[in-house]
Interface confidence: low
């Protein structure tokens, strides 16, 4: 389902899977 | 809901160590990597390194290698940062953050004699 | 080290307008995956920095569509179409294609 984040904003429910750099572990950069 | 709590706020000596907690609900810390950025007061940001709490894995900007550690317990799904060999220069806010928006409220050191 | 020239440094605005906000850096950051790890922060005053786009023009969930990111290579812009009160701030870019990564000196948006 939908979170909402420490920042106030609303994460859909795929949201772990936007591949990004600076904290996805999932991402390929480092 | 995801939270980031860090520790209060440390007034240090030159010369001496700090250590930073991170405490981490709504997740688990080994699925993401944990960074810290430090901000001097009315400055930019500066990214200080990274870990990945699965392995233990770091990397660390140079500029801060040698006397910054990064660490994590995943049993308290807590990362820590070490500072050491303190300078008044480190006088700043230092955050953690994970992926997708989460920062922590920040930890202000003031390093003073 | 990649280093991130941001400008302008200040930029007052009248509330409604817009505003652009360009972010160079010294190398590309192009990954060697063929992505671009580019990402705008917005830290406004007193608070925490949040994250607003990745990837050059990914908002995350929840950012206004007011907010979008361009650019490649070497040369980024965020813009906000129309700006609002709650968008008084510091706005920084970040690399995350090279270790180390880097962020931007900031550009500080306040209302005229």
């Known amino acids: 389902g939908w979170t909402l984040n420490s920042a106030g904003y609303l994460l859909g429910p795929h949201a772990v899977g936007n591949h990004r750099s600076f904290s996805d572990k999932n991402g390929l950069t480092s | 809901e995801v939270q980031l709590v860090q520790s209060g706020a440390e007034v240090k000596k030159p010369g001496a160590t700090v250590k930073i907690s991170c405490k981490v609900s709504?997740?688990?810390?080994?699925?993401?990597?944990m960074h810290w950025v430090q901000q001097a007061p009315g400055k930019g940001l500066e990214w200080m390194g990274r870990i990945d709490p699965e392995n233990g894995n770091t990397i660390y900007d140079p500029k801060f290698q040698g006397r910054v550690t990064i660490t994590a317990d995943t049993s308290t799904n807590t990362a820590y940062l070490d500072l050491s060999s303190l300078r008044s220069e480190d006088t700043a806010v230092y955050y953690c953050a994970r992926g997708y928006v989460d920062w922590g409220q920040g930890t202000l050191v003031t390093v003073s004699s | 080290d990649v280093v991130m020239t941001q400008s302008p440094l200040s930029l007052p605005v009248t509330l409604g307008q817009p505003a652009s906000i360009s972010c160079r850096s010294s190398q590309s950051i192009v990954h060697s995956d063929g992505d671009t790890y580019l990402e705008w922060y917005q830290q406004r005053p007193g608070q925490s920095p949040m994250s607003l786009i990745y990837?050059?023009?990914n908002r995350f969930s929840g950012v206004p569509d007011r907010f979008s990111g361009s650019g490649s290579g070497t040369d980024f812009t965020l813009k906000i179409t129309r700006v609002e009160a709650e968008d008084v701030g510091v706005y920084y870019c970040?690399?995350?294609?090279?270790?180390?990564?880097?962020f931007g000196g900031g550009t500080k948006v306040e209302i005229k």
């Open positions: 709504g997740f688990n810390i080994e699925d993401y990597y």
């Open positions: 970040f690399q995350g294609s090279h270790v180390p990564y880097t």
């Open positions: 990837k050059v023009s």
